[in-house]
């Protein structure tokens, strides 16, 4: 049983609307049917869980209703979107993939995607 490799882009710039998307790809050693994907954020020497979803291969990812994450899966690739980001949310976002079923359990953690968020400048008041 070896560590499972997880690949993700090094840097992503969030849109002006505070949305960032990136692909998390894992090299599955077996034929997993149940996969759990977790997005972690590391900033200021603290790691926190941003969101998580468990899905059956071939089905959609289902995050909690109040989650800031959405995603789709295709084979061994997960397309993740994080919304509602502000400048203070800039940080390293790490993709953690767990192959839950069937056994054996496999775990892989990516090197992280640095997401930069720039708050949009407020529109200047017009005199019209």
């Amino acid at each position: 049983c070896k560590a499972m490799h997880v690949a993700q882009p090094a840097v992503v710039l969030a849109s002006s609307r505070g949305i960032a998307s990136f692909v998390c790809e894992y090299a599955s050693p077996g034929k997993a049917t149940e996969v759990r994907v977790t997005v972690l954020r590391q900033a200021d020497s603290q790691v926190t869980e941003v969101c998580a979803a468990t899905y059956m291969m071939g089905n959609e990812l289902t995050f909690l209703d109040d989650s800031i994450c959405t995603g789709t899966s295709s084979g061994n690739q997960v397309n993740l979107t994080i919304q509602g980001l502000r400048a203070m949310d800039t940080g390293l976002y790490i993709c953690k993939v767990e192959l839950m079923y069937p056994p054996p359990y496999y775990l892989g953690i990516g090197n992280g995607t640095q997401i930069y968020v720039i708050d949009p400048e407020p529109c200047p008041d017009s005199d019209f």
Epitope: A3, Q42, L107, I109
Partner: nanobody, 130 residues
Framework: QVHLMESGGGSVQAGGSLRLSCAAS????????LGWFRQTPGKEREAVAT???????SYADSVKGRFTISNDNAKNTLYLQMNILKPEDTAMYYC????????????????????????WGQGTQVTVSS
């Protein structure tokens, strides 16, 4: 399946020593970041010491100079030598393995670092009395 099993815990007087062991099986041992965590009731797990795939070690400030982490690849065993124990070292100690060495050295300075370690032993209790 990955399996970790700690041993060596127990009760000791302040100033004493203990050596914890963690026997590992079921995976390519040397490819992982390996570490010792501890936890007291009501608090989160904290990384005490880690050892990287190249043998480099890191320690939490609270144990530097007193604890030593090492491993024996031939025996698939991780160790934590604990000297000059203090009452505040009382905790449940867990060995753990993480699949990405990138997060190894920084774990001892990072709150929530347990997220980077997916394989855990069942823990061994260390009690230090004054």
């Amino acid at each position: 399946q990955v399996h970790l099993m700690e041993s060596g815990g127990g009760s000791v007087q302040a100033g004493g020593s203990l050596r914890l062991s963690c026997a590992a099986s079921g995976y390519t041992y040397s490819r992982y970041c390996l570490g010792w965590f501890r936890q007291t009731p009501g608090k989160e797990r904290e990384a005490v010491a880690t050892i990287d795939i190249d043998g480099s070690t890191s320690y939490a400030d609270s144990v530097k100079g007193r604890f030593t982490i090492s491993n024996d690849n031939a025996k698939n065993t991780l160790y934590l030598q604990m000297n000059i124990l203090k009452p505040e070292d009382t905790a449940m100690y867990y060995c753990a393995a993480g699949p990405n060495p990138r997060y190894c050295s920084g774990a001892v300075y990072t709150r929530g670092a347990e997220h980077y370690f997916g394989y855990w032993g069942q823990g061994t209790q260390v009690t230090v009395s004054s």
